[in-house]
């Protein structure tokens, strides 16, 4: 969480951002909140990116003002116009690219004063893993698949019964490049699985951590998945 205070002839206003991550090819949100003004037309929102000459986005007098917008963001940005009056300056970024990563500044001007806060935006790919029993294998085998990851993640298996056990010797992980030549499909196979146990396939890179659980008993199979973005720090 980054909290910035503006310094100007007028009062400073509090602006708060949260470091976040974007999933390439999908839409992302750069979070920013501020101390709002009573009148929408008195609020100016500017989003800037370090190393980029033009603006990422500008909202003023109640509408988008995109004449100074940098080419790389053309047609890809929007603020939540109906929530600006309640202090939401968050930016929606469409079709996140790897090159969108970097340091952004949320800069606010109101009749009370000015304020800004920086935001670290990471980009990559992350997806939920699915763990299934591989009935084609000769022995009891689990197969963990996640369609899109970047950068290349690590994969670790764990089990509820054998806590702390190292499964690297009885597992095999492969990374297959997807058609867009950036993201990769992750496939990990775990051998010699015993029933009445819960196994977890944990996939992690510097952006996200995802876990796929499977509980195998004689009568049923239960699955659960969970994905968590890392380093979501507020400023």
């Amino acid at each position: 969480l980054i909290i910035g205070f503006g310094i100007s002839g007028r009062h400073s206003i509090t602006v708060t951002t949260v470091a976040s991550a974007g999933n390439i090819g999908e839409d992302g949100i750069l979070s920013c909140t501020f101390e709002p003004d009573i009148k929408l037309s008195d609020i100016v929102i500017q989003w800037l990116k370090e190393g980029v000459l033009g603006l990422v986005h500008e909202f003023k007098e109640g509408k988008d003002e995109l004449s100074e917008q940098d080419e790389m963001f053309r047609g890809r940005t929007a603020v939540f116009a109906d929530q600006v009056i309640v202090g939401n300056a968050s930016l929606r970024l469409k079709n996140v690219q790897l090159t969108d990563a970097g340091t952004y500044k949320c800069y606010i001007i109101t009749s009370k004063g000015k304020g800004n806060a920086n935001l670290e935006y990471k980009t990559g790919a992350f997806s939920m893993p699915e763990v299934n029993v591989d009935y084609n294998a000769s022995s009891e085998t689990l197969r963990c698949e996640a369609p899109r990851w970047f950068p290349q993640p690590t994969v670790v298996w764990a089990s509820q019964v054998d806590q702390g056990a190292n499964f690297s010797e009885v597992s095999n992980t492969s990374f297959e490049l997807n058609s867009e030549n950036v993201t990769m499909k992750v496939v990990s196979v775990l051998y010699n699985v015993t029933i009445n146990n819960t196994y977890s396939c944990m996939i992690e890179n510097d952006i996200a951590k995802a876990t796929g659980d499977i509980k195998v008993t004689e009568s049923e199979i239960k699955r659960r998945s969970h994905l968590q973005l890392l380093n979501s720090k507020a400023s």
């Epitope: 909140t33 709002p36 009573i38 929408l40 037309s41 116009a81 929530q83 009056i85 309640v86 939401n88």
Partner: antibody, heavy 122, light 113 residues
Framework: QVQLQESGPELVKPGASVKLSCKAS????????MHWVKQSPGQGLEWIGW????????MYNDKFKGEATMTADKSSSTTYMQLSSLTSEDSAVYFC???????????????WGQGTLVTVSA | DIVMSQSPSSLAVSVGEKVTMSCKSS????????????LAWYQQKPGQSPELLIY???TRESGVPDRFTGSGSGTDFTLTISSVKAEDLAVYYC?????????FGAGTKLEIK
């Protein structure tokens, strides 16, 4: 139809705290600001602040900062206001009121609750 | 803070009469950007909650009888009731929402003779 149901009257001792509630129905709770207004014989109507349940963002009148704290529970469509370190000056009727549906301002107040009487007395 | 002054503090009229009450602000409530006056009028009947009558100084809230009219601009505003009915017995408040914190006038109490 839009309804704002406030909690019942409170008799509290000086220095204590009180938490008032306002349950909303008949509209999308997370899409509108909820305001609290104080009405006392000596001071008339005074705006305390608002909360936007969609994000939890709040805005307070400087006069009530540190004394009033607003929260919202989306699951029950209820807004709360806690008043702390109460004195006899806080004896008043407190109203919750829903903000308007314009995107250019969160005012005026289009719907009001029935009010909660708070009496601060030893 | 913007100070709102209402006059008279009370008045008594007969049913059918025309009534005007005044509200003055310590600074202009007209916003040049959109030419709107950030002023509202509320009616509070005895033992009840306030109800919105007028916003943007002259826009009647849905369901409000057309005998209620708001007028004025800048710092001087008026609420007019063209033909008073017995049910109009109430206190009328003006409120500015031009700058934080929004503030109310002390009210005008309308009594029926």
């Amino acid at each position: 139809q839009v309804q704002l149901q406030e909690s019942g009257p409170e008799l509290v001792k000086p220095g204590a705290s009180v938490k008032l509630s306002c349950k909303a129905s008949g509209y999308s709770f997370t899409d509108y600001t909820m305001h609290w207004v104080k009405q006392s014989p000596g001071q008339g109507l005074e705006w305390i602040g608002w909360i936007y349940p969609g994000s939890g963002n709040t805005m307070y009148n400087d006069k009530f900062k540190g004394e009033a704290t607003m929260t919202a529970d989306k699951s029950s469509s209820t807004t709360y206001m806690q008043l702390s370190s109460l004195t006899s000056e806080d004896s008043a009727v407190y109203f919750c009121a829903r903000g308007g549906d314009s995107i250019i301002t969160v005012f005026p107040f289009t719907y009001w609750g029935q009010g909660t009487l708070v009496t601060v007395s030893a | 803070d913007i100070v709102m002054s209402q006059s008279p503090s009370s008045l008594a009229v007969s049913v059918g009469e025309k009534v005007t009450m005044s509200c003055k602000s310590s600074q202009s409530l007209l916003y040049s950007s959109n030419q709107k006056n950030y002023l509202a009028w509320y009616q509070q009947k005895p033992g009840q909650s306030p109800e919105l009558l007028i916003y943007w100084a002259s826009t009647r809230e849905s369901g409000v009888p057309d005998r209620f009219t708001g007028s004025g601009s800048g710092t001087d505003f008026t609420l007019t009731i063209s033909s008073v009915k017995a049910e109009d017995l109430a206190v009328y408040y003006c409120q500015q929402y031009y700058s934080y914190p929004p503030t109310f006038g002390a009210g005008t109490k309308l009594e029926i003779k």
